[in-house]
């Protein structure tokens, strides 16, 4: 069971300092941006991280949404990352959900975060280069200290 607590507006970056944004095709991509670029591209660079109380605290249960014309929420249905047009619900009566991720910190580095899927244990949000694009994907954690599954989350409010 997950019960919604509060939401924060955040900028999410990979460890190469590239900013996560939603492109015109609703794809989550990372790109080099200055702070002014980041502001100019809002709201596509501003994510609503909603925190949920979890009956079993395994990390901070969160949804990640964005509000352009409408609110879309990140989903990892069938291990494929996409934004679905929906508001983060107030309650989820299950222990797993395609839109719930466990946000966890890295010891000694409070600003470094990982996001594990609640539906697919051991699968994490990651940044992966595909041709010229840096994409947000769901990836099975495989190697020691994998930097691609680590992000910084900067609260904007």
């Amino acid at each position: 069971y997950f019960g919604k607590l509060e939401s924060k507006l955040s900028v999410i970056r990979n460890l190469n300092d590239q900013v996560l944004f939603i492109d015109q095709g609703n794809r989550p991509l990372f790109e080099d941006m200055t702070d002014s670029d980041c502001r100019d591209n809002a709201p596509r660079t501003i994510f609503i991280i909603s925190m949920y109380k979890d009956s079993q605290p395994r990390g901070m249960a969160v949804t990640i949404s964005v509000k352009c014309e409408k609110i879309s929420t990140l989903s990892c249905e069938n291990k494929i990352i996409s934004f679905k047009e929906m508001n983060p619900p107030d309650n989820i009566k299950d222990t797993k959900s395609d839109i719930i991720f466990f946000q966890r910190s890295v010891p000694g580095h409070d600003n470094k975060m990982q996001f594990e899927s609640s539906s697919y244990e051991g699968y994490f949000l990651a940044c992966e280069k595909e041709r010229d694009l840096f994409k947000l994907i769901l990836k099975k954690e495989d190697e020691l200290g994998d930097r691609s599954i680590m992000f910084t989350v900067q609260n904007e409010d």
């Epitope: 509060e6 605290p57 990390g59 966890r104 010891p107 409070d110 954690e141």
Partner: antibody, heavy 120, light 107 residues
């Protein structure tokens, strides 16, 4: 740098209660867990329970359920552990430990420990 | 509850020795295991998390391996400051538990 400072040593009588405090500084308090871990003389580490202040409710190890109460005051960034119905085997060093964001999956900062002696 | 069994409970070794400590979980915990070092009168110190990731500031002579139920902490070349007690901790479920500890003493 995160720092956890605990209250001083206590001597208690069997059957009484003890309340130990743990004041956090230098980091985010509300969304990171605070756990209590005890260590009896010459023994190992025992997780008693913990709290994530933003959640409000605490989680307890089965062994201590009903006898321990863990609370947190976000306004002062202080966590508390109260153990009731004390017996001699509760004589131990009690540590508070800061855990991960929203959970108990590691403990990277520890308090200095509080010795609680239960003796008649 | 998941039980954690460490072996040996104590060992004697010399400076420069390679030391191995094992930790066995009563059920599979994936890589959700941490290792701590504790010196007398001091609080524990996190050495390794998620089975094999070295905590920042910890010397590289410490390493962790294993997944599922069997895990190992290795000190490749024991140094005088490494004589201490070592604990494993599982966090597969939020009810976390520690192993009983392994004391590393000077031979």
């Amino acid at each position: 740098q995160v720092q956890l400072v605990q209250s001083g040593a206590e001597v208690k009588k069997p059957g009484s209660s003890v309340k130990v405090s743990c004041k956090a500084s230098g980091g985010t308090f509300s969304t990171f867990s605070i756990s209590w871990v005890r260590q009896a003389p010459g023994q190992g580490l025992e997780w008693m329970g913990g709290i994530i202040p933003i959640f409000g409710t605490a989680n307890y190890a089965q062994k201590f359920q009903g006898r321990v109460t863990i609370t947190a005051d976000e306004s002062t960034s202080t966590a508390y552990m109260e153990l009731s119905s004390l017996r001699s085997e509760d004589t131990a060093v009690y540590y508070c430990a800061r855990g991960g964001y929203g959970g108990y999956y590691y403990f990277d900062y520890w308090g200095q420990g509080t010795l609680v002696t239960v003796s008649s | 509850d998941i039980q954690m069994t460490q072996s040996p409970s104590s060992l004697s070794a010399s400076v420069g020795d390679r030391v191995t400590i094992t930790c066995r979980a009563s059920q599979s915990i994936s890589n959700r295991l941490n290792w701590y070092q504790q010196k007398p009168g001091k609080a524990p110190k996190l050495l390794i998390y998620k089975g094999s990731t070295l905590q920042s500031g910890v010397p590289s002579r410490f390493s962790g391996s294993g997944s599922g139920t069997d895990f190992t902490l290795t000190i490749s070349s024991l140094q005088p400051e490494d004589f201490a007690t070592y604990y494993c901790q599982q966090h597969k479920v939020w009810l976390t538990t520690f192993g009983q500890g392994t004391k590393v003493e000077i031979k």
